[in-house]
């Protein structure tokens, strides 16, 4: 019987080259969180395990930092980072809860400014 709900940052945008914090929060349940997985589409980005702590996937080690809390920080953003991100909470006794965040990475305002206003 799953009574909990996951609150997320929802749809967010960030500038290319910048960083962003992905945050989820599980509420309205007494269930105990044993692990949180962070995934991008079908790719595993990171795991925060109650016993083992954080594990960042090798392919994301340079650009992903654990935290704050159970959240995840994405750095050196590229346009290719645009897309869906999922936080998957493994809990006892409720089982699995999943939250969704959509990230849009925009060209930096400097780049946009330079493209729009050309020096004669």
């Amino acid at each position: 019987m799953m009574t909990g709900t996951i609150e997320t940052t929802g749809n967010i945008s960030a500038e290319k080259g910048g960083s962003i914090i992905l945050q989820c929060h599980l509420s309205s349940t007494t269930a105990q969180v044993t692990q949180v997985n962070w995934e991008q589409q079908d790719q595993l980005l990171a795991i925060c395990n109650a016993d083992l702590g954080w594990h960042i996937s090798p392919s994301f080690k340079d650009r992903v930092a654990p935290g704050p809390g159970l959240g995840l920080t994405l750095q050196s953003l590229t346009v290719n980072d645009t897309g869906e991100y999922f936080c998957i909470y493994h809990t006892y006794p409720d089982g699995t809860y999943t939250g969704r965040i959509f990230l849009e990475v925009l060209e930096s305002s400097v780049a946009e400014h330079g493209a729009r206003f050309q020096i004669p």
């Epitope: 269930a31 044993t34 016993d51 809990t91 006892y92 089982g95 699995t96």
Partner: antibody
Framework: QVQLVQSGSELKKPGASVKVSCKAS????????LNWVRQAPGQGLEWMGW????????TYVQGFTGRFVFSLDTSVSTAYLQISSLKAEDTAVYYC????????????WGQGTTVTVSS | EIVLTQSPGTLFLSPGERATLSCRAS???????LVWYQQKPGQAPRLLIY???TRATGIPDRFSGSGSGTDFTLTIRRLEPEDFALYYC?????????FGQGTKLEIN
């Protein structure tokens, strides 16, 4: 290795209290939920409830409220089941078991503590 | 609450035979959160199968779980002498997380 070690058998008189301990080793007690399960003589398993070892918040099944208390002492990696105002029908083996997810299951069990209530 | 009915109550078989144990729920078990345990006399239960079909660590592959909704099965492919024991199913679909009454597997 991961294990739960329970305290020894208890013989109590009706109306008395008993406190059963369950010591976790090989993992951090506060990483996983802790369940209590009762098995009366010759009977099946009965889930009594569980305690969130992170928050200390207990959840009791109907029929195990009032006289039954789940508690923790994280400094010694131990969970406790206290039963007060003991009755003859409380005679049973009491097991602690680690709650693991996901999917949920009880993956590691204590060896059980026999509580006998007799005058 | 969900009532789990296990059948048969007792199953008489010989080593080398195949055992099929049934667990039927009074209502659908959400997400197939069904677990099987084995218990031998004087011992604590031992986790065999969780999520209806996933074998627990260290469990031989002669044990398999199947089913969904209200009907679940534990199959032991070739019985070994150490498999003769009590078997319980438990559901995590809805609180309270009830157990079946058990199936006793006895040597014929």
């Amino acid at each position: 290795q991961v294990q739960l070690v329970q305290s020894g058998s208890e013989l109590k008189k009706p109306g008395a209290s008993v406190k059963v301990s369950c010591k976790a080793s090989g993992y951090t007690l506060t990483s996983h939920a802790l369940n209590w399960v009762r098995q009366a003589p010759g009977q099946g398993l009965e889930w009594m409830g569980w305690i969130n070892t992170n928050t200390g918040n207990p959840t009791y099944v109907q029929g195990f409220t009032g006289r039954f208390v789940f508690s923790l002492d994280t400094s010694v990696s131990t969970a406790y089941l206290q039963i007060s105002s003991l009755k003859a029908e409380d005679t049973a083996v009491y097991y602690c078991a680690r709650g693991y997810s996901s999917p949920p299951r009880m993956d590691v069990w204590g060896q059980g503590t026999t509580v006998t209530v007799s005058s | 609450e969900i009532v789990l009915t296990q059948s048969p109550g007792t199953l008489f078989l010989s080593p080398g035979e195949r055992a099929t144990l049934s667990c039927r729920a009074s209502q659908s078990v959400s997400r197939n959160y069904l677990v099987w345990y084995q218990q031998k006399p004087g011992q604590a239960p031992r986790l065999l199968i969780y999520g209806a079909s996933t074998r627990a660590t260290g469990i031989p592959d002669r044990f398999s779980g199947s089913g969904s909704g209200t009907d679940f099965t534990l199959t032991i492919r070739r019985l070994e002498p150490e498999d003769f024991a009590l078997y319980y199913c438990q559901q995590y679909g809805s609180s309270p997380f009830t157990f079946g009454q058990g199936t006793k597997l006895e040597i014929n």
